[in-house]
Interface confidence: low
């Protein structure tokens, strides 16, 4: 099960500080909520489970008391607090519960925690640059590709999708991997549209936790004229 | 001690084929369950199938389990692979307590599955250059096979990034390589593919206008973002 928006949640914290992670389970047993940590290259492991009937936390062996705390009474408002963070606490944290109808464990959509000792710029939201289709592509292929470059953001968790103006339909786009550049990240996404859509305005919509005011950033790609130029392909 | 081992860190397989993911486990329990989960790029963890230690081989749609209790092996086969099956797959052993709601899962490290397009006719790419300020993007469209070298040709490089190579909706490949150059106006792109070289200049058009399609109105095309 996953949260409704399908949004990858992320939290960035400095070493030594605390973080709060919320649970977003849609179904399953409310009585016992389990917390798992998955770090890249390792097996996911349970940290603890919370018994809501007795409001008690049962820690896995090797987990130091005081590191984690949980509160809340249902799967919708259950939260876990992580204290005295170190870089090795970075990873994806899942809450989970057993399905009441069928013996299987259901996981929340996961929250990525990034713990860093670096002092980041005050603004680590994605900085956009737009690329419009080349004339060669529009004339030779009767299609055009828009490219949306996003730079200097942190942490690396980002979602990009494309829409036409005045439409909520998500268009089929493609994207590169998120790449590390110094202490921040960059990513780009591109959208190829047929000639008939080139005269429409397109939007590259970017979801990132450090966007201004916490809202999706919309990068506008203007409609383009393809009829003003007559062309003669060199070699095609 | 309970332990789960997924020895394959990653596997690749073409669409429509089947892939088998191996999982070995150690347990002192006699009765238990093994679970398979799929982790999407978004990190969402989705339950796929469950195998009981006292049950016949489990099957659910395109997922089937080959369970060998004596060998402590529980292999997952995904048949008729689709591009959307590309993900990381985890095998997990359920620790049975007296009270199932507190049971723990012991996971393996996971196997990354990459589903590739089918073998198909070799297709030469189209190559186009897109520019904005010092930024240059080389767009390489609809090629097969995947192996490709993309070079942005410039004498004044600031920085370059590794290309992104992705499966196109038509099942071929698309790629984009980005770079920053002081002389962006003179940058061209050359591509080595299938022992041939393709240049962006091969696709250029004779025109008395600028290098790029014009916006309908005079708009700032650098960073017209709104929050």
């Amino acid at each position: 099960s996953s949260n409704l928006e399908g949004r990858t949640k992320s939290v960035i914290r400095q070493t030594g500080s605390s973080a709060e992670i919320t649970c977003d389970l849609a179904e399953g047993s409310t009585g016992y909520i389990h917390w798992y940590l998955h770090q890249e290259g390792k097996a996911p492991q349970r940290l603890l489970y919370y018994d809501s009937y007795t409001s008690s936390v049962v820690l896995e062996s090797g987990i130091s008391p005081g590191k984690y705390d949980t509160y809340g009474s249902t799967r919708k408002n259950l939260r876990m607090i992580l204290r005295n963070l170190i870089e090795n606490d970075s990873g994806v944290y899942y809450c989970a519960t057993w399905d009441e109808k069928y013996y299987k464990k259901l996981f929340g959509s996961g929250t990525t925690l990034v713990v860093t000792d670096k002092q980041l710029d005050a603004d680590v939201s994605p900085k956009p640059t737009i690329f419009l289709p080349s004339i060669a592509e529009t004339k030779l292929q009767k299609a055009g590709t828009y490219l949306c470059l996003l730079e200097k953001f942190f942490p690396d968790v980002i979602k990009i999708h494309w829409q036409e103006k005045k439409s909520n339909t998500i268009l089929g786009s493609q994207e590169g991997n998120t790449m590390k550049t110094n202490d921040t990240y960059m990513k780009f996404s591109w959208l190829t549209v047929p000639e008939k859509s080139l005269d429409k305005e397109h939007r590259c919509i970017v979801r990132h936790e450090n966007n201004k005011n916490g809202v999706d950033q919309e990068i506008i790609f203007p409609p383009i004229k393809t009829d003003v130029i007559t062309m003669d392909p060199k070699d095609n | 001690a309970q332990k789960v081992t997924q020895a394959q860190s990653s596997v690749s397989m073409p669409v429509r084929k089947a892939v088998t993911l191996n999982c070995l486990y150690e347990t002192s329990w006699w009765s238990y369950y093994i679970f398979w989960y799929k982790q999407l790029p978004s990190k969402e963890m989705i339950f796929l199938i469950r195998q009981g230690s006292d049950e016949q081989n489990a099957k659910s749609g395109r997922y089937s389990v080959n369970f060998k209790k004596a060998a402590k092996s529980v292999a997952l086969t995904i048949s008729a692979l689709q591009l959307e099956d590309s993900a990381k797959y985890f095998c997990a052993l359920g620790e049975p307590n007296h009270f199932l709601n507190t049971d723990k899962l012991i996971f393996g490290k996971g196997t990354r599955v990459t589903v590739e397009p089918r073998s198909q006719p070799h297709t030469k790419p189209s190559v186009f250059v897109m520019k904005n300020g010092t930024n240059v993007a080389c767009l390489v469209k609809e090629f097969y096979p995947k192996d490709i070298r993309i070079n942005l040709v410039s004498s004044k490089k600031i920085t370059e990034f590794d290309p992104a190579i992705v499966i196109s909706p038509s099942g071929k490949y698309n790629a984009v390589k980005l770079g920053k150059y002081e002389d962006s106006n003179s940058v061209t792109c050359s591509v080595q593919h299938d022992n041939k070289t393709v240049h962006s200049t091969d696709f250029e058009v004779k025109t008395d206008s600028t290098d790029h399609v014009k916006p309908k109105e005079t708009e700032n095309t650098k960073q017209p973002s709104k929050s």
Epitope: T192 | R118, P121, Y144, P169
Partner: antibody, heavy 130, light 107 residues
């Protein structure tokens, strides 16, 4: 200009054989796929077989599997349909067709090789009768 | 195999009428559906591909749409040259399959 021209049809007795040809021009069969579709008199369209000549992949309808063989000679830019053990129900106009490779805006199982048919030949009539 | 159930099998209409033909796939075929027009003694002609994309050169009065496994071909204003038989086709999975056809006749 893209063109497909079928030939080789005719009257044949049940159990007999026939080889249909599909000569392509305006494109290379090695860079595309070729498909055979038939239409029995007064009936609808029925897909028969497909070939991807560069990879060698072939596909057949259950009704012809084991009796028909699709092939291509890239040097002649021609595709063939070898039809053996012919039956009365194989009587039809046989068309060869080429797929339309435009950028499709969707994903689906199997990926690249699927496309609608934009160019068709004029058809060749095969009559199986004693 | 994916069955394509096309309806109606025939219809009578007048010039200027709006005509709708539907095809239901027995299982998901994504948008890998095409529509063809065929006239007697001629090869089929591609009208619509990818469920809703108009093939080049086809008049804009033809349109296609998809809702789940239901696919629709609409002719917004029937013209004299549109009287023909129409077929849907799924090409998302082998074997490729066609609908049974819809004959559009003059009322």
């Amino acid at each position: 200009e893209v063109q497909l021209v079928e030939s080789g049809g005719g009257l044949v007795q049940p159990g007999g054989s026939l080889r249909l040809s599909c000569a392509a021009s305006g494109f290379t069969v090695s860079s595309s796929s070729i498909h055979w579709v038939r239409q029995a008199p007064g009936k609808g369209l029925e897909w028969v077989a497909s070939i991807y000549s560069s990879s060698g992949y072939t596909y057949y309808a259950d009704s012809v599997k084991g009796r028909f063989t699709i092939s291509a000679d890239t040097s002649k830019n021609t595709a063939y349909l070898q039809m053996n053990s012919l039956r009365a129900e194989d009587t039809a106009v046989y068309y060869c067709a080429r797929p339309y490779y435009w950028y499709p805006y969707y994903y689906w199982s199997g990926g690249w090789e699927y496309a609608a048919f934009d160019y068709w030949g004029q058809g060749t009539l095969v009559t199986v009768s004693s | 195999d994916i069955q394509m159930t096309q309806s109606p099998s025939s219809l009578s209409a007048s010039v200027g009428d709006r005509v709708t033909i539907t095809c239901r796939a027995s299982q998901s075929v994504s948008s890998a559906v095409a529509w063809y027009q065929q006239k007697p003694g001629k090869a089929p002609k591609l009208l619509i591909y990818s469920a809703s994309s108009l093939y080049s050169g086809v008049p804009s009065r033809f349109s296609g749409s998809r809702s789940g496994t239901d696919f629709t071909l609409t002719i917004s204003s029937l013209q004299p040259e549109d009287f023909a038989t129409y077929y849907c086709q799924q090409y998302g999975e082998y074997p490729i399959t066609f609908g049974q056809g819809t004959k559009v006749e003059i009322k």
